[in-house]
Each structure stands twice: as structure tokens, then as C-alpha cells.
């Protein structure tokens, strides 16, 4: 139902990486505007992105309040010149989003190798602990702060002179690996949340190689 000159939003989709979370939908508005509401399963609806002509709404500020909650959003459609207008049932036209649980579903962003340091035949590779928009006690938490031991990293490494790769895992942000002295190595890391069933793995980090400025060598 609804007024003759508005159409309901459709294809409501959550786009979320490292908890930065945006709701997207269609269609591009013609003579209509949208307002978004979000709530937890047991909570009250909160309105966001009032009377917008955009087809996306940043809901990060709401979902970071409790990333383990399950959220539902809905998008209301209003005639552009008459936002008080309602549908035939006395309510504005709206469409519900799929449910979204940030902790279980946010995509893992591409990790970054922060540094690597060689000491003899050992190399310590450190993964940057990316800051999220999740807050606790007025400070922003890192990805590791949020996920704890649920988050692991897989390291791929190989000699610059060969194609054969090796791998190692860590549930911290550091790897300590054995290397052959006098050889240069390249590194790439991937974030994984083993307990998940969807959005389990990140894309690989950019490759970093020894002999470039991120590294440090000590005898």
C-alpha cells in the first residue's frame, strides 16, 4: 500500500567493514525522500538520515553501541513535497532490512603489515591493529580489542627468489618465523575469524618485502 506517488525501498543491503556500517537501498528517488529507522530486537526505533534523497545511510554510530546485538532497519518513503503524507493504512510506506549482527557479519578489512624485523634467522612480522569506531570508556577500540582471540591472522611468506610459499598463524598481531640467513622474503597477511560461518576471511594485505623501508635488520 502507499500513496500513488511514492514507491517502497527495495534491495535493502548492509555494507559493513570493520564495523563501519552503511545501509544501502534502491531505487534512486524520483519525487520522494527517505528516512531510516534502526532498532535492536528488543529496543525502540531511532530515526536517522531524515528526509534524504540519498540511497544510503551511515548507521555506524548506532551499531557500535553494542556490536553483539542484532539490528533491524527500515526505510520509509515519503512524497518529496509532502513528508506528512501517509499510505492508505495511515502509515508511511516502508520496507524492512535483513537482520544484521555486526560482530558476526561485519567484513574484515584488508589488513596491513605494520613492520618486520629480522634478527639473525628470525623475523618478527607485526600486523597493524586497526582502529575501529567501536568505543569503550571514550576511546576507540582496535580490531583486536573487539574480537580478542576470535580473530587470527594467517601469514604467507616466501623467498623473493622462489615461488614456494610457507604459512604461519597467530592469535595475536605478531608472527615470529624462521628464515634462511642472507635471503630476502616477502610477506602477506589475511585476517580470519574461525568461528564464523560467513564473512570469515579478509582479502590479503598488500605484499611487503624485505629490502624495503618497512623492515629492519639486525645481526
Amino acid at each position: 500500500s502507499g500513496t500513488t506517488n511514492t514507491v517502497a525501498a527495495y534491495n535493502l543491503t548492509w555494507k559493513s567493514t570493520n564495523f563501519k556500517t552503511i545501509l544501502e537501498w534502491e531505487p534512486k528517488p524520483v519525487n520522494q525522500v527517505y528516512t531510516v529507522q534502526i532498532s535492536t530486537k528488543s529496543g525502540d526505533w531511532k530515526s536517522k538520515c531524515f528526509y534524504t534523497t540519498d540511497t544510503e545511510c551511515d548507521l555506524t554510530d548506532e551499531i557500535v553501541k553494542d556490536v553483539k546485538q542484532t539490528y533491524l532497519a527500515r526505510v520509509f518513503s515519503y512524497p518529496a513535497g509532502n513528508v506528512e503524507s501517509t499510505g492508505s493504512a495511515g502509515e508511511p510506506l516502508y520496507e524492512n532490512s535483513p537482520e544484521f549482527t555486526p560482530y558476526l557479519e561485519t567484513n574484515l578489512g584488508q589488513p596491513t603489515i605494520q613492520s618486520f624485523e629480522q634478527v639473525g634467522t628470525k623475523v618478527n612480522v607485526t600486523v597493524e591493529d586497526e582502529r575501529t569506531l567501536v568505543r569503550r570508556n571514550n576511546t576507540f577500540l582496535s580490531l583486536r580489542d573487539v574480537f580478542g582471540k576470535d580473530l587470527i591472522y594467517t601469514l604467507y611468506y616466501w623467498k623473493s627468489s622462489s615461488s614456494g610459499k610457507k604459512t604461519a598463524k597467530t592469535n595475536t598481531n605478531e608472527f615470529l618465523i624462521d628464515v634462511d640467513k642472507g635471503e630476502n622474503y616477502c610477506f602477506s597477511v589475511q585476517a580470519v575469524i574461525p568461528s564464523r560461518t560467513v564473512n570469515r576471511k579478509s582479502t590479503d594485505s598488500p605484499v611487503e618485502c624485505m629490502g624495503q623501508e618497512k623492515g629492519e635488520f639486525r645481526e
Epitope: 587470527i152 594467517t154 618465523i177 574461525p194 570469515r200
Partner: antibody, heavy 117, light 107 residues
Framework: EVQLVESGGGLVQPGGSLRLSCAAS????????MHWVRQAPGKGLEWVGW????????IYDPKFQDRFTISADTSKNTAYLQMNSLRAEDTAVYYC??????????WGQGTLVTVSS | DIQMTQSPSSLSASVGDRVTITCKGQ??????LSWYQQKPGKAPKLLIY???SLADGVPSRFSGSGSGTDFTLTISSLQPEDFATYYC?????????FGQGTKVEIK
Amino acid sequence: EVQLVESGGGLVQPGGSLRLSCAASGFNIKDYYMHWVRQAPGKGLEWVGWIDPENGNTIYDPKFQDRFTISADTSKNTAYLQMNSLRAEDTAVYYCARDTAAYFDYWGQGTLVTVSS
Amino acid sequence: DIQMTQSPSSLSASVGDRVTITCKGQRVLNSWLSWYQQKPGKAPKLLIYYATSLADGVPSRFSGSGSGTDFTLTISSLQPEDFATYYCLQHGESPFTFGQGTKVEIK
């Protein structure tokens, strides 16, 4: 229901080649790591290698690096093990397994490869 | 490569016995160790992961302990269906390596 089904095993002459398949159902292989593990008759388990089907990264036990190749086709939800220059000592049951990164939670039933003249 | 030394290679025990199998790594594994049970003609089955965590559906008589280089699988009260071969696996760095296996037989 998660299932892994290996196929492609059989009798092959020394020096020959064989391609094993591991067809997955109930999940997308691109979301996991996929491994090949083998077991010679009456012997223990031996890790062959893994693939991340999403990006094609492969890791092998160095002893298999030159003769074996692991690949995956995400559109078919299938992982493969290409084995070349086969030897009598490659005779084994070959298993594929799904890896969550924390553990190998599902295994196929295995396919027997016999290398003999 | 990290060699995994599993012991004993076999043992005989009776129903109700407490059974302990150990696995020793050459280097620190940081809990990247899991235990598997295999019955003749069957694929291995996950029992324990992260050295101490019980896999879904596995009876609580199975437990894992240890850290660093030394790990243990314990069956607190052996049941008839537990007669099988048990393997540890380190998967913290490649090449991943299994222990040689421990065959648990009926006394």
C-alpha cells in the same frame, strides 16, 4: 549439510598422472581453507598441502611441491589435487578436509590411489 | 619443520580405564594443536582444537591439555567405541605435521 566427496582415485602406473577432485556441498569453499591429507596403507596421516580457494594461495609440504598441484574452482565448489610423476610410495588413501583456520572440521571419505605396474 | 613425537605408539586398555596420549613438538606451538580420532576405513574425526577446546558433539570424557611444546589427550573413562587410532596435528606453521598415531586396543 556439509559434505566433501573425493573422486578420481584408481590404479596408475609409475610415472603416470592423476587428478583427484573434492566436491563440496553445504558451504562455499572460498570461505575456508581446503587441505589434502594422505594415508599410506597401514600408516599414519601425512599432510600434503592447502589452498585458499578465494585467492588461489597454495602451501605444500616441500616434499610434494614439485610433483603435486592443488587448485580450486569456486564456481564448481570443488578443490583438486593434480599428481604427476607418481611413484609406488604415493599409494595411499587421499582425503580432502575443510579448515576453519582453527581446526579441520570436515573430511571426505577418501579416495584410494594405487601406483603399480 | 616441526616434528611431532606422539607416544605411546600403541596401548592396551580396558573399558573404564583412564587413557593418556602425549604429543611433543620440537618448538612452541602456541596452542595450534588439534587431536583426531580415526577408525579403520574411516576419515579422521576432530576431537580437540586449540589444544584444550572440545569439538562440538564430542563426549566430555575426552579432554586436551598442555601448551608450548607438550600436549596431552586424556580419555577419562574408556568406552567400547573409543578403540581407535588417535593423531595430534600441529597447524601453526607449514608444513603441518601429524604425530605418528597412537592405536588404542582392547586389553
